[in-house]
C-alpha cells in the first residue's frame, strides 16, 4: 500500500483539507470520492458540481483538495483511489465539530429569599459533540446535573444547578461556562443573583465619643439597618419600660439629653422588611458625674496619664464599663 491519507477534524463553517498522498508514484489515475462514492476529483478535474471543493495541488504524488464552508452533512469517509495494479483505496474521515448554537441561562425566579433553594438551568443547543457545562458562583465552581438530548447527530445539553442562596450571594454572578472542542477561549453566559434578606441591625453610639455615659450628659445612638429590600421601618423602643419623656426620636437616631440613672435600661432598635424583622439592643448604664479635681501640676500630661487619673477617682463599682450592645435577630 503506497496511498496515504490523514483524518481531518474541522469546525463547521471552516475549511477542511483532504490530501491523498502517493509514495513511489507511477503517474496512475488518482481520484477522490465523497461518502456517497461520487467522484469529487478525477486527477485535476472536478466533475462534481459542488464548487466548495477546490484543487490545492495535483501531481503524480499528491491530490490535495480543500472543502470550504464545511457542514455537518459533509461528515464521513472520503475515498482516495489510485489505479495501480492492483488498484488501491484509502479513506480519510472528516469529523465536523459544531459549537453550541445558543447558550441560554434560565433562573427559576428573578428574586430569591435568603435560605431558599433555587433552580438554575443552562442549555447549550445543537452542538457536536455534546458540550460540557461547568457552573460557577463568582469564582467558586459548583456541581450541576446534566442531561443530553440527541437529535440528528447533534446534541443539546441542559445542566441543572440547585442553589441555596445566602445574603452574601446578592449581586454575585452565576456563570454557565461551556467546554467544547470547537470553542476556543471562554464561552459563557451569566445571571446576577438577586437575594432578598431580612435587615441586619447595628447600633452606633455617636455621642459621647469616649463611650462613657454620665449623669447630665447627652446620649446619641444611631441605628443602621441594612437589608434587601431596604427596611422601610426603623423604630426605637425601650425594653420593659416606657421611653424617657426627654428622649427625642428622629428617624434612625435616638437622643437623650441630661441623662440620669432612671434612664438606665435596654434600648432596642427594630427594623423590618418584607423578608422579616431584626433588632439590636443597647444596654445603657448611666455613671455618676465626675468629681472635680485641680489641674495637674505637670504640664506634659499625656492622654494615658489623664485617662488614668480619671479612672482612679471614679468610685462607682462599675467604673470603666461601657454601655454594651447586643445584636439579636428575630
Amino acid at each position: 500500500q503506497n496511498l496515504f491519507t490523514k483524518d481531518v477534524t474541522v469546525i463547521e463553517g471552516e475549511v477542511a483539507t483532504i490530501s491523498c498522498q502517493v509514495n513511489k508514484s507511477d503517474d496512475s489515475v488518482i481520484q477522490l470520492l465523497n461518502p456517497n462514492r461520487q467522484t469529487i476529483y478525477f486527477r485535476d478535474f472536478r466533475p462534481l458540481k459542488d464548487s466548495r471543493f477546490q484543487l490545492l495541488n495535483f501531481s503524480s504524488s499528491e491530490l490535495k483538495v480543500s472543502l470550504t464552508n464545511v457542514s455537518i452533512s459533509d461528515e464521513g469517509r472520503y475515498f482516495c483511489q489510485l489505479y495501480t495494479d492492483p488498484p488501491q483505496e484509502s479513506y480519510t474521515t472528516i469529523t465536523v465539530l459544531v459549537p453550541p448554537r445558543n447558550l441560554m441561562i434560565d433562573i427559576q425566579r428573578d428574586t430569591a429569599v435568603e435560605g431558599e433553594e433555587i433552580e438554575v438551568n443552562c442549555t447549550a443547543m445543537a452542538s457536536k459533540p455534546a458540550t460540557t457545562i461547568r457552573w460557577f458562583k463568582g469564582n467558586t465552581e459548583l456541581k450541576g446535573k446534566s442531561e443530553v438530548e440527541e437529535w440528528s447527530d447533534m446534541y443539546t445539553v441542559t445542566s441543572q444547578l440547585m442553589l441555596k442562596v445566602h445574603k452574601e450571594d446578592d449581586g454575585v454572578p452565576v456563570i454557565c461556562q461551556v467546554e467544547h472542542p470547537a470553542v476556543t477561549g471562554n464561552l459563557q453566559t451569566q445571571r446576577y443573583l438577586e437575594v432578598q434578606y431580612k435587615p441586619q441591625v447595628h447600633i452606633q453610639m455617636t455621642y459621647p465619643l469616649q463611650g462613657l455615659t454620665r449623669e447630665g450628659d447627652a446620649l446619641e445612638l444611631t441605628c443602621e439597618a441594612i437589608g434587601k429590600p431596604q427596611p422601610v421601618m426603623v423604630t426605637w423602643v425601650r425594653v420593659d419600660d416606657e421611653m424617657p419623656q426627654h428622649a427625642v426620636l428622629s428617624g434612625p437616631n435616638l437622643f437623650i439629653n441630661n441623662l440620669n440613672k432612671t434612664d438606665n435600661g435596654t434600648y432596642r432598635c427594630e427594623a423590618s422588611n418584607i423578608v422579616g424583622k431584626a433588632h439590636s439592643d443597647y444596654m445603657l448604664y448611666v455613671y455618676d458625674p465626675p468629681t472635680t479635681i485641680p489641674p495637674p501640676t505637670t504640664t506634659t500630661t499625656t492622654t494615658t496619664t489623664t485617662t488614668t487619673t480619671i479612672l482612679t477617682i471614679i468610685t462607682d463599682s462599675r467604673a470603666g464599663e461601657e454601655g454594651s450592645i447586643r445584636a439579636v435577630d428575630h
Epitope: L33, R37, Q38, K49, D85
Partner: antibody, heavy 115, light 109 residues
Framework: QVQLQQWGAGLLKPSETLSLTCAFY????????WSWIRQPPGKGLEWIGE???????NYNPSLKSRVTISVDTSKNQFSLKLNSVTAADTAVYYC?????????WGRGTLVTVSS | SSELTQDPAVSVALGQTVRITCQGD??????ASWYQQKPGQAPVLVIY???NRPSGIPDRFSGSSSGNTASLTITGAQAEDEADYYC???????????FGGGTMLTVLG
C-alpha cells in the same frame, strides 16, 4: 503530437469476434482511462467501456457480457474484443482518452457486420 | 436514471444565440461535457466541467448547469457551427459513461 491511432478488421460475419487496437502516442499513459465508443450509422454515440493502465475496467451494462477490454502498458496500447457480433454491432468504433471527459479521440474505424 | 435527454434538432439564425440542453438525473451531481461532431469526423470536445473550453475552441461556446439540466450556449452562431452536439456525463456511481442522444444544429441564413 499527442494522438490516438486505431486499427482492426472492418468487415465481420455475424457471430464472429470484433477486435480493435488503439495506440497512444504521448506522455502519461498511466494517468488516464482509455475508452471505446461506437456510433451506428446515422445514430448517436454509445460508450462501450474503459480501462486504465493497471487493467481496471468498467463496461456498459448492456454490452458487458460480450465485451473484453485489455491493456498492454509496455506499448501504450489497449484493445477491444466484442464477441458474437450481429448486424446491430455495425458502427464506427472510436477509441478515446478519458479524463472523465473525452479530450482526445481516434479517427474511428468503421466495422460492418454482414453475412 | 443513467440516461441523458437532448432535443433531436435545433435551428438558429446566423449570428444569433442558441442554447442546446441536456437533462438527466446524474447532472444533479455532475457537470456535463459537450462534443461537436461534423459529418464523417470524430467528435471534438468543446466544453467540459463548469464552463471550461479546450484550447482552440472559440469563446462563443459556453456551458452552464442548473439542477438536472446542462446547457451549451453558442453566442453569435457561425455557419461552421452547424453540426451534431452530444452531451455526456457519468452515472451517479461514476463508473459508467452516458451520452445524450445528440442534437442536430442547423444554422440558417
Amino acid at each position: 503530437q499527442v494522438q490516438l491511432q486505431q486499427w482492426g478488421a472492418g468487415l465481420l460475419k455475424p457471430s464472429e469476434t470484433l477486435s480493435l487496437t488503439c495506440a497512444f502516442y504521448g506522455e502519461s499513459f498511466s494517468g488516464y482511462y482509455w475508452s471505446w465508443i461506437r456510433q451506428p450509422p446515422g445514430k448517436g454515440l454509445e460508450w462501450i467501456g474503459e480501462i486504465n493502465h493497471s487493467g481496471s475496467t468498467n463496461y456498459n451494462p448492456s454490452l458487458k457480457s460480450r465485451v473484453t477490454i485489455s491493456v498492454d502498458t509496455s506499448k501504450n496500447q489497449f484493445s477491444l474484443k466484442l464477441n458474437s457480433v450481429t448486424a446491430a454491432d455495425t458502427a464506427v468504433y472510436y477509441c478515446a482518452r478519458s479524463s472523465w471527459y473525452f479530450d482526445l479521440w481516434g479517427r474511428g474505424t468503421l466495422v460492418t457486420v454482414s453475412s | 436514471s443513467s440516461e441523458l435527454t437532448q432535443d433531436p434538432a435545433v435551428s438558429v439564425a446566423l449570428g444569433q444565440t442558441v442554447r442546446i440542453t441536456c437533462q438527466g438525473d446524474s447532472l444533479r451531481s455532475y457537470y456535463a461535457s459537450w462534443y461537436q461532431q461534423k459529418p464523417g469526423q470524430a467528435p471534438v470536445l468543446v466544453i467540459y466541467g463548469k464552463n471550461n473550453r479546450p484550447s482552440g475552441i472559440p469563446d462563443r461556446f459556453s456551458g452552464s448547469s442548473s439542477g438536472n439540466t446542462a446547457s451549451l450556449t453558442i453566442t453569435g452562431a457561425q455557419a461552421e457551427d452547424e453540426a451534431d452536439y452530444y452531451c455526456n456525463s457519468r452515472d451517479s456511481s461514476g463508473n459508467h459513461v452516458v451520452f445524450g442522444g445528440g442534437t442536430m444544429l442547423t444554422v440558417l441564413g
